[in-house]
Interface confidence: low
Amino acid sequence: NQDLPVIKCVLINHKNNDSSVGKSSSYPMVSESPEDLGCALRPQSAGTVYEAATVEVDVSASITLQVLVDTPGNISCLWVFKHSSLNCQPHFDVQNRGVVSMVILKMTETQAGEYLLFIQSEATNYTILFTVSIRNTLLFTLRRPYFRKMENQDALVCISESVPEPIVEWVLCDSQGESCKEESPAVVKKEEKVLHELFGTDIRCCARNELGRECTRLFTIDLNQTPQTTLPQLFLKVGEPLWIRCKAVHVNHGFGLTWELENKALEEGSYFEMSTYSTNRTMIRILFAFVSSVARNDTGYYTCSSSKHPSQSALVTIVEKGFINATNSSEDYEIDQYEEFCFSVRFKAYPQIRCTWTFSRKSFPCEQKGLDDGYSVSKFCNHKHQPGEYIFHAENGDAQFTKMFTLNIRRKPQVLAEASASQASCSSDGYPLPSWTWKKCSDKSPNCTEDIPEGVWNRKANRKVFGQWVSSSTLNMSEAMKGFLVKCCAYNSLGTSCETILLNSPGPFPFIQDSIS
């Protein structure tokens, strides 16, 4: 062991200087004192491998992994991270120790993992292993649950491949429509992975962990229900499992159910049937169609037929990648100050989207509701009649969608005035955007009715404040006008507002606000 070098591994934490994020490793950072990582030879390892204590880093934190090598002569080195070789420039400190550094700026999940440092000195070769992980929840995932048939049993297993291990629950409801809302007394929850009672009206499985809750509904065709006006549609991605349940109730057992895909019976092993008598002695049959991992050729019309009920179909569409279909053209609305109004986005998406509404850099929760035609809708009503730009943003892991809305509130202008040494300016919001007049107040015109025809410069909509347009008008003053009162008036279809300004020395001198409606 005499030939082995003395190795010291340290972690240096940096306080991020936001202005220099993403710069090279030499960017100026405020550093905290180095922490020793207790580098030690790894037992039972092939070759000379040193291992540092696992480094836990907060997301967005910046760190340096540093190795100090007390070995004579030159050293050469190579960092390897996730199969990729990274440049390595050793230097020597005042104590003539070799120093090798790896700077990780603004830690993200992709930078977590094993950092290997291969060092070659004149005496020996050795490897140093750093394991870098993100502290706490950032490695957590929450995936939508899916169904599997339990081996040798008529039961469904609900699976959600999530970290940390999620709590899985079945959410069952035996009534129709609105009464199956989450907190309704008609809803029964079972905190278990396996479900044997598969005859209910509405069956969902939900998984929850620290990141929230995700649910999947068991797609069902009920032959006793009036078919929807539009054909129900089920989207799946290649490789996902397909489950469709067909349910029918009849006065006795003398009926059977069958599944067909595009008029061809499903293969043996891709369906199973269950039946039971209900409390009123009618027979309930359910027939599941399932594919453990769908391919493109599983797309088509799945039809459930019964000898005693009209058949019903669903269109199953298999896509390579998730999607969000909606019109992304921006929409402008103008409403009165007390008019009730909601923004609305109608979209079709798979997998289900997560969405937000944003106004003035603030985000608002986004609710979505399924419609009968397979589309969903998200509405936003909480605008509090504030004019400006509203943004709807949706994503689902495979696709992103953004739609802009502009809300204009019809109201009469309100004028703000200011004056400088050389000009007087008035600005106004109000919608529709106002037009301007300037009047001079003089002995001849004490009521300020004398038009100022020259030196006026109108700028419409030159400034956007969160999407709200502002109109302004500027009067360039001549020497002859100094000392006079002038009046600027903004008018639109809802009224007029004026402001009187003394053309004097620099500084705002608006006074006497007239308001003529």
């Epitope: 092939a46 070759g47 390897v80 991270f81 996730k82 199969h83 990729s84 070789s85 992709t110 491949e161």
Partner: antibody, heavy 124, light 107 residues
């Protein structure tokens, strides 16, 4: 379905630069933990791994050839390009590209799909 | 670099025979090993990954075993379509390295 297709010159003169393209379909390097390797096989000889690239642009090269190789991907992430400088007759081989898939639990599946290969002859 | 030594370099066998091919790594590679089959003029095809897991669609007469440095590929009952060259690949450390192949010929 997943396919990889190699293309490039069939004949290259010594000292020239060889550029090979692997065109991907059925998958792309958009997806996290997806990668493509280049492998070659001189006539009647063994397989030799040359280089690979991952979707996040991580790259690795054969130790003996790394000074002559460059691997890259195009902006559409459906093509991977390998360039080899200063070719020599010993570089005559069938060049293959093959897919790598990285799985969530941390292991990687190497070369589940291969291209059909393109024979490159280095001769004056 | 890790060397992968395959043996034998060739073998003759008859249909129905049990065939065993060995791959030895110059240092431990855990189970980071795959087996590939190549027929003349064709690209290799993956048979086994993670030392012992059978690739989907590959007949169950193929099996893999081993861990660390010693690995074997076994064909329990050789079929006419199995006459080919077989390669092992280690992907434990870079550079990735292949064995130099075992050619299985008809006796």
């Amino acid at each position: 379905q997943v396919t990889l297709k190699e293309s490039g010159p069939t004949l290259v003169k010594p000292t020239e630069t060889l550029t090979l393209t692997c065109t991907l379909s059925g998958f792309s390097l958009n997806n996290a933990r997806m990668g493509v390797s280049w492998i070659r096989q001189p006539p009647g000889k063994c397989l030799e791994w040359l280089a690979h690239i991952f979707s996040n642009d991580e790259k690795s090269y054969s130790t003996s050839l790394k000074n002559r190789l460059t691997i890259s991907k195009d902006s559409s992430k459906t093509q991977v390009v390998l360039t080899m400088t200063n070719v020599d007759p010993v570089d005559t081989a069938t060049y293959y590209c093959a897919r790598i898939v990285g799985y969530g639990s941390g292991w990687y599946g190497f070369f589940d799909y291969w291209g059909q290969g393109t024979l490159v002859t280095v001769s004056s | 670099d890790i060397q992968m030594t395959q043996s034998p370099s060739s073998l003759s066998a008859s249909v129905g025979d049990r065939v065993t091919i060995t791959c030895r790594a110059s240092q431990g590679i855990r189970n980071d090993l795959g087996w590939y089959q190549q027929k003349p003029g064709k690209a290799p095809k993956r048979l086994i990954y993670a030392a012992s897991t059978l690739q989907s669609g590959v007949p169950s007469r193929f099996s893999g075993s081993g861990s660390g440095t010693e690995f074997t590929l076994t064909i329990s009952s050789l079929q006419p379509e199995d006459f080919a060259t077989y390669y092992c690949l280690q992907h434990n450390s870079y550079p990735l390295t292949f064995g130099c192949g075992t050619k299985v010929e008809i006796k």
